[in-house]
Interface confidence: low
């Protein structure tokens, strides 16, 4: 049976297509090609007579067609108007006609698309942004990419207008993009240049650095404030509620205890109209904010009950600190036999009794910090006294 095949079926505008013929009968008088699904003299493209080997153009000939001896038809420099059906009529020697119809589709070579936006400077959590992929063309698939990834599933992302429009509902600062649109048809694909959003946001709650709270007199106080914001935040500082200056950094040289207080950083975004503050307490003191771990020593760690005495000493290099003693989680002294001396650095037990055996430790502290020693174990033994009858006590 006579058939035709389009090579290719989908043709790019400006390219060529070959209507290939299969099962062409042997004994032929000639053949003709027609535009459309039926034989219509008014729509004849070309006729070919075997005897004369002469091709005769018909009313529908555009000058871009070439017919071959095997009945195939080549159409060059195709346009979208060439899309559709083509019918071949074969006239056999017995003058019996055979027909076959084929078709092809012409698609344009797509241009580089561009993205238009209804708002390129949206405000976070407030504005929506609609991107539209231009131009609008027929028989085109529209795709979107965010950060070189296809669109994630999100209730904030909506496609409309045949996927040509991408709407971001309630933008966030993470929606800067870049955004790209891609247009596709069966013969070509093209992607736009990336577009980024300048999302206005913030300020977030400011962070004051460094995190230190305690400073020594005579030191320099240098505080820096940062709040995520676009456009960048404008900063101001208050000390104990009194305005100081409008800078991101606050510097006070050679501080004294009078510089202790609450330091407030105020961040403002004039576009969003939002303000945020953070308060930091600064304490200027001679006291060490970190007390070193004290060392505990015993004159002896194994003693004889009711006979021996023992001295425990708590050593520290820190100044301006106090010392307290603990025994089995109880504060000392806890009996008349226990005495503290030398500014609580020494704990004396005289005499030692059985109930004094156990774990001792000391703690050094000042108003802003404290630290404990490792524990020390005191062992209390009792010597067995020989009885007059020679019997040991039972």
């Amino acid at each position: 049976q006579l058939t035709t095949e389009s090579m290719p079926f989908n043709v790019a505008e400006g390219k060529e297509v070959l209507l290939l013929v299969h099962n062409l009968p042997q004994q032929l008088f000639g053949y003709s090609w027609y535009k459309g699904e039926r034989v219509d003299g008014n729509r004849q493209i070309v006729g070919y007579a075997i005897g004369t080997q002469q091709a005769t153009p018909g009313p529908a000939n555009s000058g871009r067609e070439t017919i071959y001896p095997n009945a195939s038809l080549l159409i060059q420099n195709v346009t979208q108007n060439d899309t559709g059906f083509y019918t071949l009529q074969v006239i056999k020697s017995d003058l019996v006609n055979e027909e076959a119809t084929g078709q092809f589709h012409v698609y344009p070579e797509l241009p580089k698309p561009s993205i238009s936006s209804n708002n390129s400077n949206p405000v976070e959590d407030k504005d929506a942004v609609a991107f539209t992929c231009e131009p609008e063309t027929q028989d085109t698939t529209y795709l979107w990419w965010i950060n070189n990834q296809s669109l994630p599933v999100s209730p904030r992302l909506q496609l409309s207008n045949g996927n040509r429009t991408l709407t971001l509902l309630s933008v966030t600062r993470n929606d800067t993009g870049p955004y790209e649109c891609e247009i596709q048809n069966p013969v070509s694909a093209n992607r736009s240049d990336p577009v980024t959003l300048n999302v206005t946001y913030g300020p977030d709650t400011p962070t004051i650095s460094p995190s230190d709270t305690y400073y020594r007199p005579g030191a320099n106080l240098s505080l820096s404030c940062y709040a995520a914001s676009n456009p960048p935040a404008q900063y101001s500082w208050l000390i104990n509620g009194t305005f100081q200056q409008s800078t991101q950094e606050l510097f006070i040289p050679n501080i004294t205890v009078n510089n202790s207080g609450s330091y407030t950083c105020h961040a403002n975004n004039s576009v969003t109209g939002c303000n945020r503050t953070t308060v930091k307490t600064i304490i200027v003191t001679e006291l060490s904010p970190v007390v070193a771990k004290p060392q505990i020593k015993a004159s002896k760690t194994t003693v004889t009950g009711d006979k021996d005495s023992v001295n425990l000493t708590c050593s520290t290099n820190d100044t301006g600190i106090s010392i307290r003693w603990f025994f089995k989680n109880q504060s000392l002294p806890s009996s008349e036999r226990m005495k503290l001396s030398q500014g609580n650095t020494t704990l004396s037990i005289n005499p030692v009794k059985r109930e004094d055996a156990g774990t001792y430790w000391c703690e050094v502290f000042n108003p802003i910090s404290k630290n404990q020693s490792d524990p020390i174990m005191l062992n209390v033994n009792y010597n067995a006294l020989p009885q007059e009858n020679g019997l040991s006590p039972g």
Epitope: N121, R173, T176, T196, P231, P232, Q234, S270
Partner: antibody
Framework: KPGETVKISCKAS????????MNWVKQAPGKDLKWMGW????????TYADDFKGRFAFSLETSASTAYLQINNLKNEDMATYFC??????????????WGQGTSVTVSS | SLSASLGGKVTITCKAS??????LAWYQHKPGKGPRLLIH???TLQPGIPSRFSGSGSGRDYSFSISNLEPEDIATYYC????????FGGGTKLEIK
């Protein structure tokens, strides 16, 4: 000439001027690039690198999408090519993405 | 300066004085022109920059490579940290053998 003042201009185009900050970079003959500081084109607030505090001033003419670098009391060591460079705006600051071709300043008595 | 052969590969390193959290960019600078941003955030290629250029690193240590060297790659290359204000590294002048 030494002691004089020079003002260099940098005109931006193709984007919204007030969205991106503008940096200034110095390159003395045969030397590496050196960051001088930047100006916030939205607020007009300049930030100067330590070596460029005092005689150097950044300014704007927002309506003309133009940034300026002024050098007062010119010294021989100011002889260099000065570049303006747009402060990149990504999800995080991306350095400097687009640069001017540079303006050469010659100091001689 | 650094010398390499056409079609070859060259790697430039950049060491920061402290952790810069990957906030490092690489630039190509040719005489009479403004520098051109090739890579930002350590490894993100700028649009239009060929994939022959690449960057990597973290913490204090970063590197930048050009493979399949071409004549137009002759230039001076700079790294820029932008974690804390901006600091350029010393330029590396690339020459072709």
């Amino acid at each position: 000439k030494p002691g004089e003042t020079v003002k260099i201009s940098c005109k931006a185009s193709g984007y919204t001027f007030t969205v991106y900050g503008m940096n200034w970079v110095k390159q003395a003959p045969g030397k590496d690039l050196k960051w001088m500081g930047w100006i916030n084109t939205y607020t007009g607030e300049p930030t100067y690198a330590d070596d460029f505090k005092g005689r150097f001033a950044f300014s704007l003419e927002t309506s003309a999408s133009t940034a300026y670098l002024q050098i007062n009391n010119l010294k021989n060591e100011d002889m260099a090519t000065y570049f303006c460079a747009r402060k990149a705006f990504y999800r995080y600051d991306g350095g400097m993405d687009y640069w001017g071709q540079g303006t050469s300043v010659t100091v001689s008595s | 300066s650094l010398s390499a052969s056409l079609g070859g590969k060259v790697t430039i390193t950049c060491k920061a004085s402290q952790d810069i959290n990957k906030f490092l960019a690489w630039y190509q600078h040719k005489p009479g022109k403004g520098p051109r941003l090739l890579i930002h955030y350590t490894s993100t290629l700028q649009p239009g920059i060929p994939s022959r250029f690449s960057g990597s690193g973290s913490g204090r240590d970063y590197s930048f490579s050009i493979s399949n060297l071409e004549p137009e790659d002759i230039a001076t290359y700079y790294c820029l940290q932008y974690d804390n204000l901006y600091t350029f590294g010393g330029g590396t002048k690339l020459e072709i053998k």
